[in-house]
Every structure is written in C-alpha cells, then in structure tokens.
Amino acid sequence: KFSKQSWGLENEALIVRCPRQGKSSYIVDWYYSQTNKSIPTQERNRVFASGQLLKFLPAEVADSGIYTCIVRSPTFNRTGYANVTIYKKQPDCNVPDYLMYSTVSGSEKNSKIYCPTIDLYNWTAPLEWFKNCQALQGSRYKAHKSFLVIDNVMTDDAGDYTCKFIHNENGANYSVTATRSFTVKDEQGFSLFPVIRAPAHNETKEVEIGENTNLTCSACFGKGAQFLATVQWQLNGNKITDFSEPRIQQEEGQNQSFSNGLACVNTVLRIADVKEEDLLLRYDCLALNLHGLRRHTIRLSRK
C-alpha cells in the first residue's frame, strides 16, 4: 500500500506529509490507524493535522504508530499511510542507522549536503551543521539555504552530518535535527606526464658534515588511481640498490593525495653521517609513468 516511513526524536518537532499527494485544493483527513480516531485540526493540540501535513509539536515516543491520510477530491478518495516512529534521544554522539536519512555522495566539484525533510518546516536561516557531533567551523564550510557546501572536498570529509534548525509554529519554537551520511567519490581519474614538485631542477642543498640529512623526491601523475607511477632516487645515474653505501638508504614511496585530488608520490633519500665524498655525487629525482620520465637533479654543498 501507499506507505511512507517517518521518524523523529522525542521533544523535537516532526512534520509528516501524506504519501498520497493531491492538488492543494483537495481535503485531507487524518486518522490514527490503530483506533481509527480522527486527528484534530485545531492548532492548540500537540498533534494536529494541517491539510497534507501531520504535525507533532513536539513529538513523544508514544506517538509512534501508523497514521492514515485520506485525500478527497470531488470524485475520488485516495488513501495513504504514514508509519511514524519516535525515538528517545541518544545519550552519546552515535547516531544509529535507523535515524539516518539517505546517504549522499560528493566530489571535489559537487559537495552539497541537503538537510533532509527541511522543506516541510517553517524555518529561518542559518542552519547549524555538525559532523560526527562536532560543530563545523572554518571557511571551508558554508551553510547556504537548506544545504551545506564544503570547499575542496577531501576523503576525510566523509562522515555523518547533522543539520539542526528551529521550526516556528504560531510563535512557538521547536528544535529539529536530521542526520545523513556523506561519502566522497573520486572524480574520473586521468594521468599526466609526471610533474616533480620537489626538488627544483639543479637545486643545491646545504648540509653539515657528520650530520644526517633527508632529500625528498615528490612527483604528481594526475588524478585518481594510477596504473604505473614510480618515484625514485639515483646516485650518479645508478640505482640506490646498486650503490653499495649503507649510509644512503631510499624509503619506500609514500602515496599522497592532495586537496585538489592530485595523485602524488613521495620518496625520501636518507643520508646518515654526511661525508665530504657525498658532496661530489649527483642526486637525481626520477618520476616515471606511462607518459614518460622526468628527472630533477640536486647537489649537496657544505654549510
């Protein structure tokens, strides 16, 4: 049958629309299904019917149940059912699955999170937004009309977002909260000729003899998952593994994703107990993918 699930929290406002939509001029009668008792239309009641809307101001756990709406046109009567569940407020931050609205996905280009069901309420901006129960602060977050916009979306923006607003009915204010999950999806990936972010080509780095130093080779290869992308160091044109000097070690390349979505790799060359002969070597940062090879050279000099 034409039925819709609705849910809310005790002591908050809940407004439910009849699932059987009709033209605005049609009369709508509401009943509590278990008793077939008519829902009053007088606004002085805590629970009252207002056309296509059923209002709980505020809701109580005991209001849970199935409500019948009958929409009457001059020649047709059509029935809908609203299955309402009111839950006790959660003592902790955790929002259980049964209180979650549909999950939305976002990406770098589109990161709107709409506040669920808000169109049913008489509310005024701005909305308050929370992520995993923490109030959202900072310039990346913009509460705009009935949605939240996140600038420069990153994967760690995924999580549960709660909107909180005030519903006003005849001068009385009621709180409403609604939570939905937000997931971040990768934009369509692509690969580019490698771009080395560091070091600059023909750079010179000053070092202290006898000290340790690190050289970082950082290169980006495009967006999204990359089929082939390697970053490595060479000494005088030779692989580190072929250069028999235990003081000089190359770390495994670390994948890194920046807020702009670029797929980058960092590889660190660690030189322990810098010696005079290390200043004579040519250190090449190599970035390789299917498009080709890019090389930046760096040398060491005494401080």
Partner: antibody, heavy 123, light 107 residues
Framework: EVQLLESGGGLVQPGGSLRLSCAAS????????MIWVRQAPGKGLEWVST????????SYADSVKGRFTISRDNSKNTLYLQMNSLRAEDTAVYYC????????????????WGQGTLVTVSS | EIVLTQSPATLSLSPGERATLSCRAS??????LAWYQQKPGQAPRLLIY???NRATGIPARFSGSGSGTDFTLTISSLEPEDFAVYYC?????????FGQGTKVEIK
Amino acid sequence: EVQLLESGGGLVQPGGSLRLSCAASGFTFSIYDMIWVRQAPGKGLEWVSTIRGEGGGTSYADSVKGRFTISRDNSKNTLYLQMNSLRAEDTAVYYCARDPWSTEGSFFVLDYWGQGTLVTVSS
Amino acid sequence: EIVLTQSPATLSLSPGERATLSCRASQSVDDDLAWYQQKPGQAPRLLIYDASNRATGIPARFSGSGSGTDFTLTISSLEPEDFAVYYCQQYITAPLTFGQGTKVEIK
C-alpha cells in the same frame, strides 16, 4: 457535466500531417493534465501523450516521439495533437481523456474520455 | 516500461455467473492500477482505481483486489450490460501502459 469532443480525424497519406482537437467543457480545463490515447482497429489501448495542467510539461510514447506534438490552449479549453510524418501503424481511433488528479511527476487514471476520432493513414 | 498481462484473453460466461479477471504486472506497481470497461464503438469507462476503489457510479458487483504485481477484477454476478472488454492500466510510472484486454462474452 464534463464533456470531451475530439475532431480533426480523417484519411491521410503516409508522410502526411493531421491536427486533432479536443474541446473540453464542464470543468476547469486549465488545472487538469490531459492525455491522448489511441486504439488501432481491433486492438488494445495505447497511451500516446500527456500534457500537464500546471506548467504545461509534455511526455510522449516512444512510438510517436519527434513526430507528434501535444499542446493546449487554456483560453479556448482545447487540447491539440499535431501529427506529422504519419505512418500506416498510426491508424487508430484517437481519444482525448482527462487525468483528474495527478500532481507534477505523477499520474492517475483517466476518468473522462471523448468519443474518439478515427485517423486512417493509407495511400 | 511496465508490461501488463491480462488473462484469460476471453471469458465465456452466462448472466448471473461470477467473472474473475486477472492482470499481472512485470514489476511492482504498488496499488497504482485501474480497470476500465469498453463496449463496442464506445470509449473506455473507468471502473476501479487504486486497485480496489470503485469509481463514482460503479455498481457494487464490481470489485478489485491485489497489490504489487497481481491484481483481480471480480464481477460477482454478471448482468447483460457487463459483457464487454476489460482493460487494466498502471499509472505508477511513465509510460502509462494498458493490458491487452479480456473479453467477457455471453456463453
């Protein structure tokens, strides 16, 4: 009393054009969705096209898309179906009908129908 | 599109007998299903809407039942004027589709 009266049917050659009209009376025409349904001789009913009352949005069956155009003139309480590039398989009785309920994006039954007008496509 | 299959194609019965017509949808239409009656040379006439509600002016001998994919139109006791073709129609989604019809004829 609600009445729908189709006109404009007739014999037309393949590739030709025809414009059907449906004059409505007895109800507030402008707020209702209106529909064309056709019935080939000895066959069943086939939805052809819908035009919304509020907003005037249109939709078409795949079999007529790009060839037929539904329109309405609310000031004249009249529904139209412009049929171009007619084919033999378009031969049918064309009925206009009223959807008494539907809201944007939804559909309902057809509670009033005209008596139909016969379109014959033949060389 | 949603395909509606009606059975039987023809039903041969005598006045006073009970007629049971079936309509099966290729996917769920909830209760968004209607039944129409059509007599030769006439336009269809709405009998049942929302699967089980009688339209205004339709005699109580016509009843509809079902939900989801299986629906039934029952005429409890056939009157002479009930011999006609009956169509089911779904309106849950575009395009609106009709069944191919069941002809109820006099035995």
